[in-house]
């Protein structure tokens, strides 16, 4: 299993939207992609989960565009706020 986030950093003005890309490789048939936000304290905050058999996930300002064949799960954060400045991680799990 492998997860790749090619964007090392991204800068966007407040109130705009940003899309963070995540590509993965897996041999699992059924799996989940999780998006987390890392606080300055290094604490990881769960944001949203995309299931391999589920519709595109949406939760508040967070939405996922899932492309199953391309093995791509992009996180969009809309109406950006200053508090959104952070490091974001995607993770793969069964």
């Amino acid at each position: 299993q492998k997860v790749t986030q090619a964007q090392s950093s991204v800068s966007m003005p407040v109130r705009k939207a940003v899309t963070l890309n995540c590509l993965y490789e897996t041999s699992w048939w059924s799996y989940y992609i999780f998006w987390y936000k890392q606080l300055p304290s290094k604490e990881m905050i769960f944001l949203i989960r995309q299931g391999s058999d589920e519709q595109n996930a949406k939760s508040g300002r967070y939405s996922v565009n899932f492309k199953k064949a391309a093995k791509s799960v992009a996180l969009t954060i809309s109406a950006l706020q200053l508090e959104d400045s952070a490091k974001y991680f995607c993770a793969l799990g069964e």
């Epitope: 048939w29 059924s30 299931g51 391999s52 058999d53 589920e54 519709q55 595109n56 565009n65 899932f66 492309k67 199953k68 064949a69 391309a70 093995k71 791509s72």
Partner: antibody, heavy 117, light 106 residues
Framework: QVQLQQSGAELVRPGASVKLSCKAS????????MYWVKQTPVHGLEWIGA????????AYNQRFKGKATLTSDKSSSTAYMELRSLTSEDSAVYYC??????????WGQGTLVTVSA | QIVLTQSPALMSASPGEKVTMTCSAS?????MYWYQQKPRSSPKPWIY???NLAAGVPARFSGSGSGTSYSLTISSMEAEDAATYYC?????????FGGGTKLEIK
């Protein structure tokens, strides 16, 4: 209303190649993958492969590797499938279908390909 | 790959009759999807995530099942329901379709 307009029927000779097109409208072309499906009376519906128009990433059913090549053109919102070294086994109706996870939510009208000498 | 077997392959029903067709998977799948196809037309999305009806699908249709066994039911057959119905899974790669159940009106 999402539309997938496929190219017209093709009559081709054995051994030749053919390139089918699928023009998408009324949605952001790069936001979802385009899949291709083959339908015959014998084998029913079979997934051929898929392309992500945003990145060009493709995935193929092992059965169709070497037979089909998928491409897309973002500027015209069109997906293409080229079939090579055609035989009678390739005579079928071919559909493009837009994947909205987790299923094939929109389908083109189909293109009939007939391989005959 | 996961093989989907639909039964019966061909069936007929009278108007008003209850109709049930099944789809059996060779391995367990999370959800099943169903499409309706009429002659000289492309497949229409019909039921998604096992039991959710696509927009415009009459309420007399329902879907159910889990694991390796799924079904599509029409509570009261109508003439316009005559068509071929295909099940499809996307739990395993590649996505696969069943061979179809052709439903005719008596």
């Amino acid at each position: 209303q999402v539309q997938l307009q496929q190219s017209g029927a093709e009559l081709v000779r054995p051994g030749a190649s053919v390139k089918l097109s699928c023009k998408a409208s009324d949605y952001k072309f790069t936001d979802s993958e385009m899949y291709w499906v083959k339908q015959t009376p014998v084998h029913g519906l079979e997934w051929i492969g898929a392309i992500d128009p945003e990145t060009g990433i493709t995935a193929y059913n092992q059965r169709f590797k070497g037979k089909a090549t998928l491409t897309s053109d973002k500027s015209s919102s069109t997906a293409y499938m080229e079939l090579r070294s055609l035989t009678s086994e390739d005579s079928a109706v071919y559909y493009c279908t837009r994947a909205v996870p987790p299923w094939f939510a929109y389908w083109g009208q189909g293109t009939l390909v007939t391989v005959s000498a | 790959q996961i093989v989907l077997t639909q039964s019966p392959a061909l069936m007929s029903a009278s108007p008003g009759e209850k109709v049930t067709m099944t789809c059996s998977a060779s391995s367990s799948v999370s959800y099943m999807y169903w499409y309706q196809q009429k002659p000289r037309s492309s497949p229409k999305p019909w039921i998604y995530l096992t039991s959710n009806l696509a927009a415009g699908v009459p309420a007399r249709f329902s879907g159910s099942g889990s694991g390796t066994s799924y079904s599509l039911t029409i509570s009261s057959m109508e003439a316009e329901d005559a068509a071929t119905y295909y099940c499809q899974q996307w739990s395993g790669d590649p996505p696969t379709f069943g061979g179809g159940t052709k439903l005719e009106i008596k």
